[in-house]
């Protein structure tokens, strides 16, 4: 969370950004809020990126002005125009690329004053893991798969019954490059598992942490997955 203050004569406004992460190939949002101003035509939003000449996006007088937009962002940006008057200057970024990572500045000018704040935008790939019972191995095994990760994550297994146990010797993890030659599919197999025990497959890189849980009993297979972006907030 970054809060910036701006001074315009005697006037300053608070601009707030949130460090966020973009999933390459998907759409992302760079979050920025400011003190609302009911005079839409008096609001100017400028998004800038460190090291890039020209603007990422500009919104003024109630509409986009892309005359100074850098070509790498052409056709890929939008603000939430209907939410600008309530103080939302967040930027929608289509088809996130690895090269979109960096430091961005959200600059705001309104009739109340002006202000800006920076945000760090990380890019990579992250996806929810799915754990299934694996029948290819000779022993009772579990297979944890996640289709898209970058940079290469670490993978670890844990179990509710054997807390603190090291499963590296009874698991096998592989990374398979996807067709676009950037992201990778993660596959990890855990051997010699038992029923009535909850096993967790944890996948983590510097952008995200994902966990898949599975519990096999006589009567059912219970699964749960969750994904958490790191250093966001």
């Amino acid at each position: 969370l970054i809060i910036g203050f701006g001074i315009s004569g005697k006037h300053f406004i608070t601009v707030t950004t949130f460090t966020s992460a973009g999933n390459i190939g998907e759409d992302g949002t760079l979050s920025c809020t400011f003190e609302p101003d009911i005079k839409l035509n008096g609001i100017v939003i400028q998004w800038l990126k460190e090291g890039i000449k020209g603007l990422v996006h500009e919104f003024k007088e109630g509409k986009d002005d892309l005359s100074q937009q850098h070509e790498m962002f052409r056709g890929r940006t939008a603000v939430f125009a209907d939410q600008v008057v309530v103080g939302n200057a967040s930027l929608r970024l289509k088809n996130v690329q690895l090269t979109d990572a960096g430091t961005y500045t959200c600059y705001i000018r309104t009739s109340k004053g002006k202000g800006n704040a920076n945000l760090e935008y990380k890019t990579g790939a992250f996806s929810m893991p799915e754990i299934n019972v694996d029948y290819n191995a000779s022993s009772e095994s579990l297979r944890c798969e996640a289709p898209r990760w970058f940079p290469q994550p670490t993978v670890a297994w844990a179990s509710q019954v054997d807390q603190g146990a090291n499963f590296s010797e009874v698991s096998n993890t592989s990374f398979e490059l996807n067709s676009e030659n950037v992201t990778m599919k993660v596959v990890s197999v855990l051997y010699n598992v038992t029923i009535n025990n909850t096993y967790s497959c944890m996948i983590e890189n510097d952008i995200a942490k994902a966990t898949g849980d599975i519990k096999v009993t006589d009567s059912e297979v219970k699964r749960r997955s969750q994904l958490q972006l790191l250093n966001s907030g």
Epitope: Y135, I195, V221
Partner: nanobody
Framework: EVQLVESGGGLVQPGGSLRLSCAAS????????MHWVRQVPGKGREWVSR????????SYEDSVKGRFTISRDNAKNTVYLQMHGLRAEDTAVYYC???????????????WGQGTLVTVSS
């Protein structure tokens, strides 16, 4: 209450055939893998075969591969074991059981019927 009722056993000559049936009730049949297990009198139980809930995946113990075929009719809540080329060593009480997965460690199975006796003898 889970109920499994096996039938179809009997006395058959070596090389002969039998078709075992198992009628299931008291649970959602299509949620479960079904397994056949056999027990030679005086010995421990041995897993024979399994079939996935939709019937698309089957597996067999090595000694029965190519001779036994497992199938299921989900409309009738029934699983079958077609046995050809029967041998003396196939003599056993045959049980069907259910489990949430295709894992087939005997100690995992909690529900058993009365079994059906298959005797292979000339």
């Amino acid at each position: 209450e889970v109920q499994l009722v096996e039938s179809g056993g009997g006395l058959v000559q070596p090389g002969g055939s039998l078709r075992l049936s198992c009628a299931a009730s008291g649970f959602t049949f299509t949620d479960f893998w079904m397994h056949w297990v056999r027990q030679v009198p005086g010995k421990g139980r041995e897993w024979v075969s399994r079939i996935s809930p939709d019937g698309s995946s089957t597996s067999y113990e090595d000694s029965v591969k190519g001779r036994f075929t497992i199938s299921r009719d989900n409309a009738k809540n029934t699983v079958y074991l077609q046995m050809h080329g029967l041998r003396a060593e196939d003599t056993a009480v045959y049980y069907c059981t259910r489990f949430s997965t295709g894992w087939h460690r005997i100690e995992y199975f909690q529900h058993w019927g009365q079994g059906t006796l298959v005797t292979v003898s000339s």
